[in-house]
């Protein structure tokens, strides 16, 4: 059953150019694999709290503990990474707080900034003191397990010294690591004793061994790379947005809708309108009009700006977002006041989420 009647044909062509929406950056909690993580839901006066991960309900299990406003993840794994939300259900409304969990080691073995001064890792020896290879900076080699999100860059480092200066080669899963073994190859920076792989993919998972050797000896060190994959999900909208607003006749107002979606989202701003003096069609469904949608001729679709408003602009505005997987929508109300009344954004009054599901 359709939930509304469109007042006019709203052809959605031309489609929007591709955009990767990750506009709103929620707080990020980082944990290393195997660690425990505890997050407190930062919402007040919560009668009942429910949790989701990547838009899917999260229940307790042998590693996930939900106690009051706390979420505990024991022995975190890269699979625990994702977009989490806690929703506080109250008597009259509900509110959601989003946060990211990233279960991963540092993306590189040692910080990227080290490359600027990394020459210090290239130790020159007095030519008389012959010496087998040795590690010069073991702190940069402590983290052996690297869990990295797909498409990120990975850098492994094995800073070493010796005399004569040792050479470095890399193995993957115990075999010679060749450029043709991965799309885009890899970079070796001998000056910094590093291996760099850009835009990692799942097939990059495995053990990477640096072998450092000269005529007096050989040493090696192995890193394990795990590439964390994403799962596609329906769009997720930041709770409390768009927010209710008020303005005087002739004033301007802006509604904002924050979208989380890896897959290409299509954003629509819709308003309940009247046709022939009626808000509902013969089928009993409300008349709706698409005011703005993402596309080539549209500026930032996450923002709906209304200028020089009239009393007729008052009413409910819906932000509706769709990707190829599913949809989500939330709405807000615009109150238009007579000229003599001072407007104020009604921060306290947020429309409760109204998902078309």
């Amino acid at each position: 059953r359709p939930s509304f009647s469109l007042v006019e044909d709203t052809t959605l062509e031309p489609e929007e150019p591709p955009t990767k929406y990750q506009i709103s950056q929620p707080e990020v909690y980082v944990a290393a694999p195997g660690e425990s993580l505890e997050v407190r839901c930062l919402l007040k006066d919560a009668a009942v709290i429910s949790w989701t991960k990547d838009g899917v309900h999260l229940g307790p299990n042998n590693r996930t503990v939900l106690i009051g406003e706390y979420l505990q993840i024991k022995g975190a794994t890269p699979r625990d990474s994702g977009l989490y939300a806690c929703t506080a259900s109250r008597t009259v409304d509900s509110e959601t707080w989003y946060f990211m969990v990233n279960v991963t080691d540092a993306i590189s073995s040692g910080d990227d900034e080290d490359d600027t001064d990394g020459a210090e890792d290239f130790v020159s020896e007095n030519s008389n003191n012959k010496r087998a290879p040795y590690w010069t900076n073991t702190e940069k080699m402590e983290k052996r397990l690297h869990a990295v999100p797909a498409a990120n860059t990975v850098k492994f480092r094995c800073p070493a010294g010796g005399n004569p200066m040792p050479t470095m080669r890399w193995l993957k899963n115990g075999k010679e690591f060749k450029q043709e073994h991965r799309i885009g190859g890899y970079k070796v920076r001998n000056q910094h004793w590093s291996l760099i792989m850009e835009s990692v993919v799942p097939s990059d998972k495995g053990n990477y061994t640096c072998v450092v050797e000269n005529e007096y000896g050989s040493i090696n060190h192995t890193y394990h790379l795990d590439v964390v994959e994403r799962s596609p999900h329906r769009p997720i909208l930041q709770a409390g947005l768009p927010a209710n607003a008020s303005t005087v006749v002739g004033g301007d107002v802006e509604f904002v809708c924050k979208v989380y979606s890896d897959a290409q989202p299509h954003i629509q701003w819709i308003k309940h309108v009247e046709k022939n003096g009626s808000k509902y069609g013969p089928d009993g469904l409300p008349y709706l009009k698409v005011l703005k949608h993402s596309g080539i001729n549209s500026s930032n679709a996450e923002v709906l700006a209304l200028f020089n408003v009239t009393e007729a602009d008052a009413g409910e505005y819906i932000c509706k977002v769709s990707n190829y997987i599913g949809q989500a929508n939330q709405s807000a109300w615009l109150t238009v006041l007579p000229k003599q009344q001072a407007p104020g954004r009604e921060k306290e009054i947020t429309a409760s989420p109204d998902y078309l599901e």
């Epitope: 059953r1 359709p2 939930s3 509304f4 959605l12 062509e13 031309p14 489609e15 929007e16 150019p17 591709p18 955009t19 990767k20 797909a150 498409a151 835009s199 993919v201 799942p202 994959e229 994403r230 596609p232 329906r234 890896d262 897959a263 290409q264 769709s322 990707n323 190829y324 997987i325 599913g326 949809q327 998902y355 078309l356 599901e357």
Partner: antibody, heavy 112, light 106 residues
Framework: QVQLVQSGAEVKKPGSSVKVSCKAS????????MHWVRQAPGQGLEWMGA????????DYSQKFKGRVTITADESTSTAYMELSSLRSEDTAVYYC?????WGQGTLVTVSS | EIVLTQSPATLSLSPGERATLSCRAS?????MYWYQQKPGQAPRPWIY???NRATGVPARFSGSGSGTDYTLTISSLEPEDFAVYYC?????????FGQGTKLEIK
């Protein structure tokens, strides 16, 4: 587990219509788009359109607009694809798809 | 509409060899999706969001690329990998597929 079970094969005359059904189970039917894709014999895949059962929103390929109608029955978790004014080049296997799962396909043969 | 061109149309290789399948879009897309299809079967989602393997897809498969050029790579072919592979874009309506690359045993 997720399952999409489609109706059986059909033989149709040119100019007539066909209605293919796709019964979904194992997930929340109203929360995901149901897409329809067809494949002519020995040919590639062609996206036709989709429906969002939660509010009956539809999205069609321009090529099929006016000739295809996609509907959904929430009570039975079933999606339907009706193609009218059939011609011989519409002979194909028609698939329903929930982004990560596909139905087994329905062969529609258009022949006089 | 966005036209996806796959190359080669047919790729003849032996088990154990490396396979590289290409998909080029007529205009930029944000992600590419890949499907595997065997004779008499429905297509199976294989790679989503350019580089993520679908459930049950072996680690020897990897996807990469950006903008208009995307690649599906099979590091070492197994007998069960021989099939037709289609790329698809979900960036704009109509959501088009490539014409397919048939991976056959040499």
């Amino acid at each position: 587990q997720v399952q999409l079970v489609q109706s059986g094969a059909e033989v149709k005359k040119p100019g007539s219509s066909v209605k293919v059904s796709c019964k979904a189970s194992g997930y929340t039917f109203t929360s995901y788009w149901m897409h329809w894709v067809r494949q002519a014999p020995g040919q590639g895949l062609e996206w036709m359109g989709a429906i969002y059962p939660g509010n009956s929103d539809t999205d069609y390929s321009q090529k099929f607009k006016g000739r295809v109608t996609i509907t959904a029955d929430e009570s039975t978790s079933t999606a339907y694809m009706e193609l009218s004014s059939l011609r011989s080049e519409d002979t194909a296997v028609y698939y329903c798809s929930k982004f990560d799962y596909w139905g087994q396909g329905t062969l529609v043969t258009v022949s006089s | 509409e966005i036209v996806l061109t796959q190359s080669p149309a047919t790729l003849s290789l032996s088990p154990g060899e490396r396979a590289t399948l290409s998909c080029r879009a007529s205009s930029s897309v944000n992600y590419m999706y890949w499907y595997q299809q065997k004779p008499g079967q429905a297509p199976r989602p294989w790679i989503y969001l350019t580089s993520n393997r679908a459930t049950g897809v072996p680690a020897r498969f990897s996807g990469s690329g950006s903008g208009t050029d995307y690649t599906l790579t099979i590091s070492s072919l197994e007998p069960e990998d021989f099939a037709v592979y289609y790329c698809q874009q979900w960036s704009s309506n109509p959501y088009t597929f490539g014409q397919g690359t048939k991976l056959e045993i040499k």
